[in-house]
């Protein structure tokens, strides 16, 4: 009775757009066989220089590499030649060709569907775990924000199938040693932790293993808690500027903070010849602040324009939130005008701005 | 109980400004992220943007960005998206959801997830 | 899409570029907000009927109904997060027959 509604047919796909560059072909080569991949120009026009990338870095040529401008050659192909290769134009590194290589122990037997998370029998007669993508096993240490998800992979082949699972400081983890359990997905040899807490925090090995071998990875995961602070102004901003007398001029203040920040610009004053108040407390103007209709992004800068020597001096951005104040300032010089400046030369004058 | 509850909607004119706000309970604010998702009525679902209280980062789908800013003050747990120079292909049922990242080594990019939804508020920009 | 309770449905989504397992399906009911129900392409979120269950990789993906219960009548949408800006498929209504 379920087989004619198994097979009843789909209706229209969802079009989910995705990401830059063109599709990515997923290639299986034998350990052994010469690995050759072609990337003909977009539209049959002329290509340009290119360049053949593996795993981010550039290929460079050799006698087992051979690299021209449209095909790939890589003789005698290993474990080690498993990875991302794309082509790429020289100037722009624009992505022109993208493809997925895995290299077996196995000869090659065509695509393989579901790229590296799936469990497969590699066809070898017998053989020890190995992972299928080591170059993706390099980072070890995880950092994650509370409450987010965390999932663990060690994607592994072998022959017969290994078996994977999963240990915490050492010892088997199951889902019952968590608040929220655990999923595991032997297919894709994964682990997911949702939710994670400080308790989470910890080394977590995986160990995947057959009756010929056996290979762990271990994986430390640090869980952070979020301490609300002020607010923090990025490093060199606003910066220090000098203008001409008449042109605009614009300060920059990026501020960092969890709660809502209440932004000012302020520019030093002098009053009656003196820069701060008997307390100590610098004698300010403010020239911006939050109006009903003004965003964080507009009071992130400061315009000023036809500037006037009377706007040299010290401009101050000041972040407050909830819990205290940070700031930054920077000193605006205005020079004379470009005929000023010949005059002044010519009378042998220096303006000190 | 994870709470999400939007406010703010209501009908303006073409140019005008509106802000949304995102009312957030149950939850570590400032470790999961809030985005902002509308549907205009008989039309699909549309992602607006997001923000992540923890570092104050956002991201913006190119059809409001420099229009829309979405802000946070963890203080009290609420997230705001503030709406300028509103045309009337904006008008829609504007939706906050709770967002989290899937954090994985073996891959290069953050799955984000929406997985709790407030109910929605209506704006409406029309003459 | 019409379809009577106690059917398997099947619903597809297609990619136009790898978008790995990042995927995630959500159920929409007039009037309503979304609702999670897949995660990573094929992670059941908590508190989802075992009904509900995903597969995919790369640019083809599909969310299955094991049993169509009455209260799963709704539109369906899938979404990629494997880019910024993340997006949605356009949807798929499932109504009563």
């Known amino acids: 009775e379920s087989l004619g509604t198994e097979q009843r047919v789909v209706g229209r796909a969802a079009e989910v757009p995705g990401p830059e560059p063109g599709q990515q072909e997923q290639l299986v080569f034998g350990s052994g066989d010469a690995v050759e991949l072609s990337c003909p120009p977009p539209g049959g026009g002329p290509m340009g220089p290119t360049v053949w990338v593996k795993d981010g870095t550039g290929l460079v040529p050799s006698e087992r590499v051979l690299v021209g401008p449209q095909r790939l050659q890589v003789l005698n192909a290993s474990h080690e030649d498993s990875g991302a290769y794309s082509c790429r134009q020289r100037l722009t590194q624009r992505v022109l060709c993208h493809f997925s290589v895995r290299v077996t122990d196995a000869p090659s037997s065509g695509d393989d569907e579901d790229g590296e998370d799936e469990a497969e029998d590699t066809g070898v007669d017998t053989g020890a775990p190995y992972w299928t993508r080591p170059e993706r096993m390099d980072k070890k240490l995880l950092a994650v924000p509370a409450a987010n998800t965390v999932r663990f992979r060690c994607p592994a082949a072998g022959n017969p199938t290994p078996s994977i699972s999963w240990l915490k400081n050492g010892r088997e983890f199951r889902g019952e040693h968590r608040i929220g359990g655990i999923k595991l997905r032997h297919q894709q040899w994964s682990l997911v932790m949702e939710s994670v807490v400080p308790s989470d925090r910890g080394n977590y090995t995986c160990v995947v293993e057959n009756k010929f071998g056996s290979i762990r990875q271990t994986y430390t995961l640090d869980v952070l808690e979020r301490s609300p602070h002020r607010p923090i102004l990025q490093a060199g901003l606003p910066a220090n500027q000098t203008a001409v007398l008449g042109s605009d001029v614009e300060f920059h203040c990026k501020v960092y903070s969890d709660a809502q920040p209440h932004i000012q610009w302020l520019k030093h004053v002098e009053v009656n010849g003196s820069k701060v108040g008997p307390d100590g407390t610098p004698y300010v103007t403010v020239l911006k602040t939050a109006g009903a209709n003004t965003t964080d992004k507009e009071l992130e800068v400061l315009s000023l324009h036809n500037v006037t020597f009377e706007d040299a001096g010290e401009y101050t951005c000041l972040a407050g939130n909830s819990i205290g104040f940070s700031h930054h300032s920077a000193w605006l010089v205005v020079l004379p005008a470009e005929e000023e400046l010949v005059e002044a030369d010519e009378a042998g004058s220096v303006y000190a701005g | 109980e994870v709470q999400l509850v939007e406010s703010g909607g209501g009908l303006v004119q073409p140019g005008g400004s509106l802000r949304l706000s995102c009312a957030a309970s149950?939850?570590?604010?400032?470790?999961?992220?809030i985005s902002w998702v509308r549907q205009a009525p008989g039309k699909g679902l549309e992602w607006v943007g997001r923000i992540y209280p923890t570092n104050g980062s956002t991201n913006y789908a190119d059809s409001v960005k420099g229009r829309f800013t979405i802000s946070a003050d963890t203080s009290k747990n609420t997230a705001y998206l503030q709406m300028n120079s509103l045309r009337a292909e904006d008008t829609a049922v504007y939706y906050c959801?709770?967002?989290?990242?899937?954090?994985?080594?073996?891959?290069?990019?953050?799955?984000?997830?929406?997985?709790?939804w407030g109910q929605g508020t209506l704006v409406t920009v029309s003459s | 899409r019409s379809e009577a309770s106690g059917d398997r449905v099947t619903i597809t989504c297609r990619a136009s570029q790898d978008v790995s397992t990042a995927v995630a399906w959500y159920q929409q009911k007039p009037g309503k907000a979304p609702k999670l129900l897949i995660y990573s392409a094929s992670f059941l979120y908590s508190g989802v009927p075992s009904r509900f269950s995903g597969s995919g990789s790369g640019t083809d993906f599909t969310l299955t109904i094991s049993s169509l219960q009455p209260e799963d009548f709704a539109t369906y949408y899938c979404?990629?997060?494997?880019?910024?800006?993340?997006?949605f498929g356009q949807g798929t209504k499932v109504e009563i027959k």
């Open positions: 959801a709770r967002t989290y990242g899937i954090y994985d080594l073996y891959v290069d990019y953050t799955e984000y997830v929406m997985d709790y």
């Open positions: 979404q990629q997060s494997y880019t910024t800006p993340p997006t």
């Open positions: 149950g939850f570590t604010f400032t470790s999961t992220g």
